[in-house]
Interface confidence: medium
């Protein structure tokens, strides 16, 4: 038997993936555990093996189908269970009635690219990945720019309160190396959270022209 507090958190990427993290105080030793998904009105169920991510937490991804297939809707409820092997049988360690569109976390934006760069400004675009058509334009973004000598945590957040897959960064320093990241969040869902940050995009502003005032 396992004692201690347990936390079971899952997010839906809005298409065909539910990612789960299960943490348990009084960690299990060499025990096989899995997450089992049982939808309320779908003809499939799915299982994934929980793999350790730290001493007391495990994670797995329930792959529900092809990456861009719409496997769940706003009215679905999925019973999610953590099952751990105890001898010859499985024991239910945690359970939740999961409402996918109340617990959204999209994939990180992809395909970041510099559209145009000048001495003091840079126009950057990106794409969202595996986002449901249900959102239409109901998405928001946060972006941050890493300046030399600073950390990501120190970078101010720029908020885009609409589905705008580009940004024009202003007041940059000429001939300077920067990095840029963006993340996305649907407006829908009580427990919805930001996507992971995108892979950083490195770019360099153009040097100031000789003899010009900077």
């Amino acid at each position: 038997a396992v004692n201690g507090t347990s936390q079971f958190t899952c997010f839906y990427n809005s298409r065909a993936n539910i990612s789960c993290v299960w943490s348990q105080d009084g960690a299990l030793q060499d025990t096989s555990c899995q997450v089992h998904a049982w939808p309320d009105r779908r003809r499939w169920n799915q299982t994934c093996e929980l793999l350790p991510v730290s001493q007391a937490s495990w994670a797995c991804n329930l792959i529900l189908g092809a990456p861009d297939s719409q496997k769940l809707t706003t009215v679905d409820i999925v019973t999610l269970r953590v099952l751990c092997r105890e001898g010859v049988r499985w024991r239910v360690m945690a359970i939740q009635d999961f409402k996918p569109f109340e617990n959204l976390r999209l994939m990180a934006p992809i395909s970041l690219q510099v559209v145009h760069v000048e001495t003091h400004r840079c126009n950057i675009s990106w794409e969202i990945s595996q986002a449901s058509h249900y959102f239409e334009r109901h998405l928001e973004f946060e972006a941050r720019t890493l300046s030399p000598g600073h950390t990501w945590e120190e970078a101010p957040l720029l908020t885009l309160k609409q589905k705008q897959e580009w940004i024009c960064l202003e007041t940059l320093t000429p001939d300077t190396q920067y990095e840029f990241q963006v993340r996305v969040k649907p407006l829908q869902g009580e427990f919805t959270t930001w996507s992971p940050w995108s892979q950083p995009l490195a770019f360099r502003t153009k040097p100031a022209a000789l003899g010009k005032d900077t």
Partner: antibody, heavy 119, light 106 residues
């Protein structure tokens, strides 16, 4: 063998309250969703709501706010608390469970309990 | 809410007749269920997932359809089939039933 047994029905005055019970046997209420469905005399079936295996509930908007579904895991029993009852709530109330998968439909039903709302 | 309209509301047929009941949904549904309810009894599941026969149900019962239009058939009516039949959708909440079709023997 899966069995559902409703109880708690009877005569109640308009504006009154009543709590129906649904005793489950042959399965654990923490493993399956259980639904409440009613049927007014001479009428069709109306879905009222459900309590899922994890304990969350879902209601028909027609009764949300007046009716509450709950359960006692230790007794393996479901409840339907009905408040502010009206004459139109007079019906036979059933609890029902789907088959091994929810989409198997309501494979298991109780025998029903009659609620009469009248002064 | 999705409205389910059954037709006919009642019918009378002879033993051995083929009986067909239709259920029209107000918007497209993914799958349909059919129940039999004898007087004074709880409903009994006959067909799930549009066309699958529930456990212990005779093969004279069948179902078909898609989208908004579904059909339930009794290939050869038997005296014990006297009952009211209901369709039900489980595509969106609230779950809804048809108003019922009462089947009688001539």
């Amino acid at each position: 063998e899966v069995q559902l047994l409703e109880s708690g029905g009877g005569l109640v005055q308009p504006g009154g309250s009543l709590r129906l019970s649904c005793a489950a046997s042959g399965f654990s209420v923490t493993s399956y969703g259980v639904h409440w469905i009613r049927q007014a005399p001479g009428k069709g079936l109306e879905w009222l709501g459900a309590i899922w295996s994890g304990g969350s509930t879902q209601y028909n908007a027609a009764v949300k706010g007046r009716f509450t579904i709950s359960r006692d895991n230790s007794k393996n029993t479901l409840y339907l608390q009905m408040n502010s009852l009206r004459a139109e709530d007079t019906a036979v109330y059933y609890c029902a469970r789907a088959g091994d998968a929810n989409y198997d439909g309501f494979a298991y039903w109780g025998q029903g309990t009659l609620v009469t709302v009248s002064s | 809410d999705i409205q389910m309209t059954q037709s006919p509301s009642s019918l009378s047929a002879s033993v051995g007749d083929r009986v067909t009941i239709t259920c029209q949904a107000s918007s497209s549904v993914s799958f349909m269920y059919w129940y039999q309810q004898r007087p004074g009894k709880a409903p009994r599941l006959l067909i799930y997932d549009t066309s699958n026969l529930a456990s212990g149900v005779p093969s004279r019962f069948s179902g078909s359809g898609s989208g908004t239009s579904y059909t339930f058939t009794i290939s050869s009516l038997q005296p014990e089939d006297i009952a009211t039949y209901y369709c039900q959708q489980w595509s969106t909440y609230p779950l809804t039933f048809g108003q019922g079709t009462k089947v009688e023997i001539k």
